[in-house]
């Protein structure tokens, strides 16, 4: 055998963000020579789980019948072949929603905004939290974090967008979280529909105006401009 065994591929179905109590299956795909698959979870004693391969031996299934806090975290998998253990897979981050009560998402001054103007999405939680996430439906990179600088607990986070274009239109939700586990999120807020109308100067703004690559707007991270307000929160792009 020349060189190390190729690393396996790790993924989750139906996805890696799972509501409390729902089932999820983690798959690890290696090679046809695999004899055993092992799943390790960061900050937990190893091995987290072991499974025999499914025919034709190139993958294994790790089932979670009911998602709880215990299963949220960062995973890697390996496979063992006759010549030894593979390299670890790229990590899979399994996130559980429903750990805390849902925050409230609102738009200031209004969810109906004229292109070129400014709007701020406000995510508010009943209890103090130190991380807030804004998610746009059907965006390939939907997460925008605001995280407190020094672990200071906040009741809200502001997500300013300026200038608004049609790219910003769509359905948003927000989540809140505590810093001790970024894999545990609140229930999602109720959805907020942000409607962007054309202006006299720019009746139909180009949807690709605010992005710098050839990809379409839904393939880009949400990129509001403007400084983070004086809340002690810092912006993180995921």
């Amino acid at each position: 055998q020349a060189g190390p065994l190729p690393k396996p591929t790790l993924w989750a179905e139906p996805g890696s963000v799972i509501s409390w109590g729902n089932s999820v299956t983690i798959w690890c795909q290696g090679t046809l020579e695999a004899r055993e698959y092992r799943l390790d979870k960061e900050e937990s004693p190893a091995p987290w789980d072991r499974q025999n391969p499914l025919e034709p031996k190139n993958k294994a299934r790790f089932s979670i019948p009911s998602m709880t806090e215990d299963y949220a975290g960062r995973y890697r998998c390996y496979y063992r072949s006759p010549v030894g253990w593979s390299q670890p897979s790229d990590p899979l981050e399994l996130v559980m929603t429903g750990a805390y009560s849902k925050p409230t998402l609102s738009a200031l001054p209004s969810p109906l905004v004229t292109s070129g103007k400014s709007v701020t999405l406000l995510c508010q939680s009943r209890s103090p939290m130190d991380t807030f996430l804004l998610i746009k439906e059907r965006a390939a990179h939907p997460l925008l974090h605001l995280r407190s600088e020094h672990g200071a607990q906040q009741h809200q986070a502001e997500f300013p967008m300026s200038p608004v274009t049609s790219v910003h239109g769509g359905t948003y939700r927000c989540f809140s979280s505590h810093g001790f586990s970024h894999y545990l999120l609140s229930h999602p807020s109720d959805p907020l529909e942000l409607i962007v109308s054309g202006s006299l100067e720019d009746p139909r703004p180009s949807p690709t105006r605010s992005v710098s690559t050839a990809a379409g707007p839904e393939d880009q991270p949400l990129m509001p401009t403007g400084s983070v307000p004086h809340s002690g929160l810092r912006r993180h792009w995921e």
């Epitope: 979870k41 900050e43 937990s44 004693p45 190893a46 091995p47 987290w48 789980d49 072991r50 215990d70």
Partner: nanobody
Amino acid sequence: EVQLVESGGGLVQPGGSLRLSCAASESIFSSNVMGWYRQAPGKQRELVAAVGIQGLTKIGDSVKGRFTISRDNAKNSVYLQMNSLRAEDTAVYYCAAGAYVRFLQQSPDYWGQGTQVTVSS
């Protein structure tokens, strides 16, 4: 064939210490999380502590700061050091082995026969 063998249990006064040992076959020890459960009369079985193959440990909330777990790879053995013992620590202590997710589900693949620990004056 007995694959996990515990020792070290006994009677100890409150505030005292005990060290439990569990010897495992090499094939089980080398590829599994090793840990300890306990069961007091009339109570549910409770995970006390576990240690992974790379040495990462998890300690139950009720014994944190008093109990430690360690593994000796050369001897295929795992140890539970119990300090500042209390009457409520009285139970049968079981050595167990398996993947960690099975510990969370209270269903490790391998179990010892158990050793009695009694804390009483």
